[in-house]
């Protein structure tokens, strides 16, 4: 019997201080350019080595963010979101949805923390 | 398997052009950043041309300006360079590199070397 895959949705307040090289992340999304099917949704694609973001440590690849300094992120096409992030600030305040994977064992196994998978 | 594939290039006289291209396969490119880079012979790799994923702004190194055109297809899944009025100093080697996503960083100097994941194995471009 194949196990089933879960998700466990977390939602964070993230505080970065724009770097040197900036914010230090790229982004996926929008109601032009779905990542991710039947979601309009900004999404992280890619964290900057040494950047603020990788310095700070918890904003991760796969991360949907929802707002930026209380400005909600739907129904924005692509490269608005881009501007926005771009002349957000030097103090920028996201809050994110994170989304572990979980592997669930088949029903009956005891195994939910099981982070395999 | 990720793969980017140049071609295009050869052997052209000063004042001629070229038209390179850089075909992706096993991804999508509608979601990636993508540019031109070329090394010359005992000389650093550099960025010479990039677009980001929407096709809605590009770079452009001060050396090319007014000559060289970069391009995106998504439904070809290709990207070009179009390369006018050749001179010398443009013999290099020409790659595509992608990135996914584009940056919420300023400055179009976005076409770093160090911003992109994924690289092809280039096109010798030869003017003489």
């Known amino acids: 019997m194949n196990g089933r895959v879960d998700y466990l949705v977390t939602e964070e307040e993230i505080n970065l201080t724009r770097g040197p090289s900036g914010l230090g992340f790229n982004i996926v999304g929008g109601t032009d350019q779905q990542y991710v099917s039947n979601d309009s949704g900004i999404y992280v694609s890619r964290i900057k080595e040494n950047g603020a973001a990788a310095l700070d440590g918890r904003l991760q690849e796969g991360d949907k963010i929802l707002s930026v300094n209380g400005q909600d992120l739907k129904n924005l096409l692509h490269q608005d979101a881009v501007d926005l992030f771009r002349n957000a600030g030097y103090a920028v305040s996201l809050r994110v949805q994170h989304r572990l994977q979980v592997q669930n064992g088949p029903i009956g196994h005891r195994g939910e923390g099981d982070p395999s998978g | 398997e990720v793969q980017l594939v140049e071609s295009g290039g050869g052997l052209v006289q000063a004042g001629g052009s070229l038209r390179l291209s850089c075909a992706a396969s096993?991804?999508?490119?509608?979601?990636?950043?993508i540019g031109w880079f070329r090394q010359a012979p005992g000389k650093e790799r550099e960025g010479v041309s990039c677009?980001?994923?929407?096709?809605?702004?590009?770079f452009y190194a001060d050396s090319v300006k007014g000559r060289f055109t970069i391009s995106r297809d998504n439904a070809k899944n290709t990207l070009y360079l179009q390369m006018n009025s050749l001179k010398p100093e443009d013999t290099a080697v020409y790659y595509c590199?992608?990135?996914?996503?584009?940056?919420?960083?300023?400055?179009?100097?976005?076409?770093?070397?160090?911003?992109?994941?994924?690289w092809g194995q280039g096109t010798q471009v030869t003017v003489s």
């Open positions: 096993g991804f999508t490119l509608d979601y990636y950043g």
């Open positions: 590199a992608a990135v996914l996503g584009d940056s919420v960083d300023y400055g179009m100097g976005y076409c770093n070397l160090d911003e992109y994941d994924y």
């Open positions: 677009i980001d994923s929407s096709g809605g702004s590009t």
